[in-house]
């Protein structure tokens, strides 16, 4: 007679899981399971994660919170977002630095170190793409500079210096013999 009824909650479903005697509802994000429920389909006793720990998942049955990661100072990392009860520390690079992945197949959780961004201005070049996820992409030489080899050379200030063809095109000087 008792077996003809449907179960009170789905123990294998998304919201309940058999913990100990009963199917218990999970804990919200930022909380850990202190004690399982004491009745069928009941609420577990859930407590807030202690400082420096977190749990990001909703409706979980974890009995302890995960330790917040510390950003790697040796790799010049900084905390972009501090750890909270519901989210881990988000490590990244400070302004003027970019992420250099330490593995070839780079994903968000891959180990990385921070590299200083190229200063296009110091190289006398235009900044084509600002440095953030990758190094700065520098463009052509700034006005008053011309391409010479790998770098930008300042236009001569007098007619006494030599001014090759590229120089003449950029600097407005005719080639001097």
């Amino acid at each position: 007679q008792g077996g003809t009824r449907s179960p009170r909650c789905d123990c294998a479903g998304d919201f309940h899981k058999k913990i100990g005697l009963f199917c218990c509802r999970g804990c919200p994000a930022g909380h850990y399971l202190k004690a399982p429920c004491t009745e069928p389909c009941g609420n577990s006793t859930c407590l807030v994660c202690p400082q420096d720990t977190f749990l990001a998942w909703e409706n979980h049955h974890n009995s302890e919170c995960a330790r917040c990661q510390a950003c790697d100072e040796q790799a010049s990392q900084v905390a972009l977002e501090n750890c909270s009860a519901v989210a881990d520390t988000r490590c990244g690079c400070k302004p003027g630095w970019f992420v250099e992945c330490q593995v070839s197949q780079c994903v968000s959780s891959s180990p990385f170190y921070c590299q200083p961004c190229l200063d296009c201005g110091a190289l006398h070049r235009h900044t084509r793409l600002l440095c953030s996820r990758r190094d700065t992409d520098c463009g052509t030489c700034l006005p008053g500079f011309y391409e010479h080899g790998d770098g930008c050379v300042s236009c001569p200030t007098s007619t006494l210096g030599s001014c090759p063809e590229r120089c003449a095109a950029v600097c407005g000087w005719r080639q001097m013999f």
Epitope: R5, R8, C11, I19, G20, L21, T38, E39
Partner: antibody, heavy 122, light 111 residues
Framework: EVQLVESGGDLVKPGGSLKLSCAAS????????MSWVRQTPEKILEWVAT????????YYPDNVKGRFTISRDNARNNLYLQMSHLRSEDTAIYYC???????????????WGQGTSVTVSS | DIVLTQSPASLVVSLGQRATISCRAS??????????LHWYQQTPGQPPKLLIY???NLESGVPARFSGSGSGTDFTLNIHPVEEEDVATYYC?????????FGRGTKLEIK
């Protein structure tokens, strides 16, 4: 045939400790939650402790919580009740019981041992 | 905690007559169609024995003269016709939530 045999009952002074054992046979012990229930000299039945099957979780009423510890040894088919800081009101016959349940999550004590007597007195 | 109140505390019935035992809970022990109330029989010198589970389900091997009914807070155990071997104390117990509790028992005697 399901059998539950308790042992370890004794006369003990208030504040003392005692460990009860229950030897189970005739069924797949590890697949069942198990309990201890006691019956006072006034014939009152009281639930004392339960241990679940699987990852063992333990449950106690407030009047024994922190003083009694239920445990199990699935390899030996044994159930235990460690009792400490005993009081005169813990005097009773202690029964080992098997908990039957199904997916509907009701529990009922379908088999009981013969009991072991615990007397707490100075 | 849910308190179970049994009445009467003792009962004297003639052989072949009906014995009716009541168990009242301080809070509903029923939910989603389930009545988490069970009945046990304890004969002198023996441990309790499960008679009826979930208010009305007869445990295997228990004679059909035993029956249970009720829901919510009011439950009844009926024995009809009463036989000599039914002399015992009868207890109700709930498993709706922890802590599980028992009634104080009803002692059945034959007139």
């Amino acid at each position: 045939e399901v059998q539950l045999v308790e042992s370890g009952g004794d006369l003990v002074k208030p504040g003392g400790s005692l460990k009860l054992s229950c030897a189970a046979s005739g069924f797949s012990f590890s697949a069942y939650a198990m309990s201890w229930v006691r019956q006072t000299p006034e014939k009152i039945l009281e639930w004392v402790a339960t241990i679940s099957d699987g990852d063992p979780y333990t449950y106690y009423p407030d009047n024994v919580k922190g003083r009694f510890t239920i445990s199990r040894d699935n390899a030996r088919n044994n159930l235990y009740l460690q009792m400490s800081h005993l009081r005169s009101e813990d005097t009773a016959i202690y029964y080992c019981t098997r908990e039957r349940n199904d997916y509907d999550q009701y529990y009922t004590m379908d088999y009981w041992g013969q009991g072991t007597s615990v007397t707490v007195s100075s | 905690d849910i308190v179970l109140t049994q009445s009467p505390a003792s009962l004297v019935v003639s052989l072949g007559q009906r014995a009716t035992i009541s168990c009242r809970a301080s809070k509903s022990v029923s939910t989603s169609g389930y009545n988490y109330l069970h009945w046990y029989q304890q004969t002198p010198g023996q441990p309790p024995k499960l008679l009826i589970y979930l208010a009305s389900n007869l445990e295997s091997g228990v004679p059909a003269r035993f029956s249970g009914s009720g829901s919510g807070t009011d439950f009844t155990l009926n024995i009809h016709p009463v036989e000599e071997e039914d002399v015992a104390t009868y207890y109700c117990q709930h498993s709706r939530e922890l802590p599980w509790t028992f009634g104080r028992g009803t002692k059945l005697e034959i007139k």
